[in-house]
Interface confidence: low
């Protein structure tokens, strides 16, 4: 006769582990008992349970309520047992010893592998700012047994590096994703992908990149000179910029306070019916937490009664102040 068993039994944490031990013998052979033991390199061999032909299943009190026979129907030659709710401490080597009559004793050893699925966590790096060099965008850590695989899925150009810490019964893997921040990355997804034999499918955690930047400011509204004539209504100057975080806008007049009736509404400067008093240099101030930028334009309101006067559109000048 011989024992049919497995070299390795793999089970996910919390599941029931079936430890197989089936005696394949001649029809006239009988199994007297099947003894299950835990083989520990430090503690030696520790009885787990005993399947006795006469006494049935008896479990070592230390494993009470955790060891059972598989549900019926059962073959009298099947000495397999179920280890309920496998925990990491159950991982290791097990032995079944089958006492048969008249063939004698047979024994087999197997390894129980308890997979501990990882629960990944993603930690964003320091705030990203356009103009920085290679910077940590995010790190992703996953601990499990065996060691999980941690990779990144993204369209963003960057570099990834991993390091591993081994604990007595598990391993923690941390992967970092570094990049050179640019405004094109803003809003792009950066996904940490964790693979592990204990997972039915990869675990994914997505982080949306936020890169702080502030674009050059420019002013629109002076393109049509005919709008800037005395008496005209609805004239506006609009300050154009973009940034992350979204910028705030402010308007001032370089050569004095804003004329009466001129209204600031966010990025737009609204004029009342135009008079020559509205001529002057206007400055748009754009700022966010990262920096600030200025753009100035010269407005000259044309008086149709005075043909010598023309609307003068001065090229905008730009200034940039980093916070």
């Amino acid at each position: 006769g011989e024992l049919e068993t497995s070299d390795v039994v793999t089970v996910v944490l919390g599941q029931d582990a079936k430890l197989p031990c089936f005696y394949r013998g001649d029809p006239d052979e009988q199994v007297g008992q099947v003894a299950w033991a835990r083989v520990d390199p430090n503690e030696g061999i520790r009885e787990l349970a005993l399947l006795h032909s006469k006494y049935g299943l008896h479990v070592n009190p230390a494993y009470e309520d955790r060891v059972e026979q598989p549900p019926p129907p059962r073959d009298p030659l099947d000495g397999s047992v179920l280890l309920r709710n496998a925990v990491q401490a159950d991982e290791g080597e097990y032995e079944c010893r089958v006492s048969t009559f008249p063939a004698g004793s047979f024994q087999a050893r197997m390894r129980l592998r308890v997979l501990v699925p990882p629960l990944p966590s993603l930690n964003p790096g320091p705030p990203l700012e356009e103009g920085q060099g290679l910077t940590l965008a995010a790190s992703c850590t996953a601990e499990g047994s065996p060691a999980p695989s941690v990779t990144w899925d993204t369209e963003v150009k960057g570099t990834q590096s991993s390091r591993s810490f081994t604990h007595p019964r598990s391993a923690a893997v941390t992967s970092e994703f570094h990049l050179v921040p640019s405004r094109s990355m803003n809003g792009q997804p950066l996904t940490c992908v964790v693979s592990h034999p204990g997972l039915l499918q990869d675990r994914r955690i997505t982080h949306t990149l936020q890169v702080a930047f502030l674009a050059e400011a420019s002013v629109r509204g002076l393109e049509d000179q005919n709008l800037w004539q005395v008496g005209r209504e609805g004239a506006t100057l609009k300050c154009l910029s973009e940034g992350q975080p979204p910028p705030k806008y402010n308007w001032t007049r370089l050569d004095g306070p804003l004329p009466s009736g001129v209204r600031v509404k966010g990025d737009t400067l609204g004029f009342p019916p135009l008079t020559t008093e509205h001529s002057g240099v206007y400055v748009c101030h754009v700022s966010n937490e990262l920096s600030s930028r200025d753009s100035q334009v010269t407005v000259e309101v044309l008086d149709p009664e005075d043909p010598g006067k023309q609307v003068d559109l001065v090229s905008a000048s730009h200034h940039h102040h980093h916070h």
Epitope: G32, A35, Y55, H58
Partner: antibody
């Protein structure tokens, strides 16, 4: 048929030594947990010591710890009890018994061997 | 160590009587309790194991019950061959321990 036969008993002086043997037959000795149990004249049963199939797990009653040593030789199907520093209170019939494990009942017993400690 | 306390230590009964012997463990031993019968000059014989399971060949008038710390051996109708000493034994942990015994005598 399962048989357990003890031998080695006899009269010994206090402080003396004896070695008991238990020869097993009719079952796979090497798979079974073996125990020594004693019974003083007119008294109850007292478990003395036990040893697992591979000698990996050994236990003793407090009353004999440090004086008695249990061992087995699976190749000879024999269980032993080395008794040193014997005292008058060790006088008893010594039985060997087998069980599937220490947490199973003692289902087969030998006929016993009498140890008398007296000056 | 687990102490096993058996009571009574002796009792007198007549053939046909119902006899009950109790055994108390000093801590919870689940159902790891066995009962043995010993006749004078004879080897102990296993009657009941796992608190309530009858050993093969043992008459059905013997029964066992209990779990945890309190256990009972009952002989429903005492027969002449049942006059003997009865011992309980815990197999929950080593050292294995026996009760002091209950001697059942003829009234």
């Amino acid at each position: 048929e399962v048989q357990l036969v003890e031998s080695g008993g006899g009269l010994v002086q206090p402080g003396g030594s004896l070695r008991l043997s238990c020869a097993a037959s009719g079952f796979t000795f090497s798979d079974y947990y073996m125990s020594w149990i004693r019974q003083a004249p007119g008294k109850g049963l007292e478990w003395v010591s036990g040893i697992s199939w591979n000698s990996g797990s050994i236990g003793y009653a407090d009353s004999v710890k440090g004086r008695f040593t249990i061992s087995r030789d699976n190749s000879k199907n024999t269980l032993y009890l080395q008794m040193n520093s014997l005292r008058a209170e060790d006088t008893a019939v010594y039985y060997c018994a087998s069980s599937g494990s220490w947490y199973l009942p003692l289902d087969y017993w030998g006929q016993g061997t009498l140890v008398t400690v007296s000056s | 160590d687990i102490q096993m306390t058996q009571s009574p230590s002796s009792l007198s009964a007549s053939v046909g009587d119902r006899v009950t012997i109790t055994c108390q463990a000093s801590q919870d031993i689940s159902n790891y309790l066995n009962w043995y019968q010993q006749k004078p000059g004879k080897v102990p014989k296993l009657l009941i194991y796992a608190a309530s399971t009858l050993q093969s060949g043992v008459p059905s008038r013997f029964s066992g019950s209990g779990s945890g710390t309190d256990f009972t051996l009952t002989i429903s109708s005492l027969q002449p061959e049942d006059f003997a000493t009865y011992y309980c034994q815990q197999s929950y942990s080593t050292p294995l321990t026996f009760g002091g015994g209950t001697k059942v005598e003829i009234k």
